[in-house]
């Protein structure tokens, strides 16, 4: 048994161009917290596969508010270590996922909203009891600096936390063949109970007489390295130089799978099929429990009351993923009207409206005519978020405030002369034409193409356009 410890040193913009925007603002202050997920082995596992070695959540960091105009600095971090206890042997090789989460502290309905800011992952070799290992990982424009180590919990010692130490029975020295337990020099190694010849570096046991191998080693005494090159068969050529499995005992001999797991050989090694509730290369690790708080965003954890039963997160509406860490894309329903851009903030949907529209869903066509009368008897006409004035005769301009020259457009046809008049324009028609715009020819016999002119108005006289 032991504890994996993670110390976050900094989280902020990485080097190079394209610095990220601060995740917090004066309007939406926020604070960070971190989640670590550990899995045994070096296999590329999906982000959603169980955190079989364990998971932990940090405390919340200090509240941070962006300084307007300032670049995003390293953000204030939570105090303390993230600690992931492990019950069984430390596997020596492990995969990690470290997530940086943002908790928004605005006045949103229903409490704070969480969103995933960055996720980094990696695979490492690490011996328990060793010094702190430093690491830098980048996620997009963000950079995370951290250190980690695995340490054994007494009475366990060793690179896999599988050797046990006991207080000395005699004050001066340990019993025959037993060494002092560094760094606990006042304690002695417990008597070995593993199978005779079991490799002290690559093997361990939890029951007398057994020999179980750490990852990368196989054979009845855990002395055979598992091949990293391809062999002709599971029992490939017998050569110390190839690193292939030697003929003789197969990788499943002695069943390396713990907790009732069943072993099957693979071309390079073996594979354990684990019973419900157990994970890892050898089924040596039990799953995360609900006590570890694996469900995000208010997800309800069921099952997983003890390490022998797997947990399930029942996600609240709008969230999904095995840990309720993903949002449902509500913007795909296109709730914003009039071409507005949809933003899902988690606690609410927001619409960024196009010019001329407003409202929570861009539903309001901005009424530019409200309180903006057109002058001189003009009428306001709306459309597409803009407005225009339809001006009375003799006036023009945006608000009908300019006196229009009614003759500017040369409205009189067939050479008629135009005169501006207080109520519009008047056309004085050339001989042979008549009408308000001199548009009608006078027939040669003196009759017009129009009904008879009103009394007192002869063809060719100026006609006033009303």
């Amino acid at each position: 048994a032991g504890v994996f410890e993670l110390q976050i040193h900094s989280f902020g913009p990485g080097p190079g161009p394209g610095a990220p925007r601060s995740p917090c603002s004066a309007r939406l202050p926020c604070r960070l917290f971190f989640r670590v997920c550990l899995k045994p082995g070096l296999s590329e596992e999906a982000a959603e596969s169980p955190c079989a070695l364990g998971a932990a959540l940090s405390a919340r960091g200090p509240v941070y508010t962006e300084q307007p105009g300032a670049p995003a600095p390293d953000l204030p971090l939570p105090d303390g270590l993230l600690q992931v206890p492990f019950r069984d042997a430390w596997p020596g090789t492990f995969s990690f996922i470290i997530e940086t989460w943002r908790e928004e502290l605005g006045d949103q309905i229903g409490g704070p909203a969480w969103s995933l800011l960055a996720r980094v992952a990696g695979r490492r070799r690490l011996a328990a009891g060793g010094p702190w290992a430093r690491d830098i990982q980048r996620a997009g424009a963000w950079e995370l600096r951290f250190s980690y180590r695995a340490r054994c919990e007494p009475p366990a010692v060793g690179t896999a936390c599988t050797r046990l130490c006991r207080p000395r029975s005699a004050p001066s020295r340990c019993g025959p063949g037993l060494r002092p337990c560094a760094p606990l020099e006042d304690e002695c190694e417990a008597p070995l109970v593993c199978r005779a010849g079991c490799s002290p570096e690559h093997g361990f046991c939890e029951q007398p007489g057994e020999c179980r191998c750490l990852e990368g080693w196989t054979g009845p005494l855990c002395t055979v390295p598992v091949s990293t090159s391809s062999c002709l068969s599971p029992r490939g050529p017998s050569s110390a130089t190839t690193g292939c499995l030697v003929p003789g005992p197969g990788p499943c001999d002695g069943n390396p799978c713990a907790n009732g797991g069943s072993c099957s050989e693979t071309p390079r090694s073996f594979e354990c099929t684990c019973p419900r509730g157990f994970y890892g290369l050898r089924c040596e690790v039990s799953g995360v429990t609900c006590a570890d708080g694996p469900c995000f965003n208010g997800g309800l954890c069921v099952g997983g009351a003890d390490p022998d039963s797997a947990y399930i997160c029942h996600c609240p509406p709008g969230f999904q993923g095995s840990n309720c860490e993903k949002r449902v894309d509500r913007c795909s329903l296109q709730p914003c009207r009039n071409g507005g851009l949809c933003l899902d903030l988690g606690h609410a949907l927001r619409c960024r409206c196009r010019a001329g529209f407003a409202g929570p869903r861009c539903e309001h066509d901005l009424d530019d005519c409200a309180g903006r009368a057109c002058a001189n008897g003009g009428t306001c006409v709306e459309g597409g978020g803009a407005h225009r004035c339809s001006c009375a005769l003799g006036f023009g301009g945006r608000d009908c405030r300019e006196r229009a020259d009614p003759c500017a457009a040369r409205p009189c046809a067939h050479g008629g002369r135009c005169y501006a008049h207080f109520s519009g324009l008047v056309c004085a028609c050339a001989p042979g034409y008549m009408g308000a715009r001199c548009e009608f020819p006078v027939h040669p016999d003196g009759a017009s193409a129009l009904p008879a002119a009103p009394p007192g108005l002869r063809p060719g006289d100026p006609q006033r356009y009303l």
């Epitope: 509500r330 296109q334 009207r337």
Partner: nanobody, 119 residues
Framework: EVQLVQSGGGLVQPGGSLRLSCAAS????????IGWYRQAPGKQRDMVAG???????TYADSVKGRFTISRDNAKNTVYLQMNSLKPEDTAVYYC?????????????WGQGTQVTVKP
């Protein structure tokens, strides 16, 4: 508070049809956008079909030509007619609505309806 109550669903053979309905109830509300999402085991919850805020119908590419969304405004009900069903349509189907209550907009989900397509 607005309730979205779903009905329909069930087991059907490939090539068969089903009709889902979703009735919205509550007081003093108006529906802005409404539609259907679905979630297959181990997969994301994705939009299937809907009426957008502008009242336009929208469909996921995988269901175009097979599924039809319709509504009855008088009953505040939306329907999803599913034809030519395939095994990959098996999922829990959720009704979703963006609803205006007073001056605010809120998002609501139905309780979910299982649709299983298998021979």
């Amino acid at each position: 508070e607005v309730q979205l109550v779903q009905s329909g669903g069930g087991l059907v053979q490939p090539g068969g049809s089903l009709r889902l309905s979703c009735a919205a109830s509550g007081s003093d509300f108006s529906i802005n956008a409404i539609g259907w999402y679905r979630q297959a085991p181990g997969k994301q919850r994705d939009m299937v079909a809907g009426f957008t805020g502008d009242g336009v119908t929208t469909y996921a590419d995988s269901v175009k030509g097979r599924f039809t969304i319709s509504r009855d405004n008088a009953k505040n009900t939306v329907y999803l007619q599913m034809n030519s069903l395939k095994p990959e349509d098996t999922a829990v189907y959720y009704c979703a609505a963006d609803v205006k209550i007073g001056g605010d907009y809120e998002w609501f989900w139905g309780q979910g309806t299982q649709v299983t397509v298998k021979p």
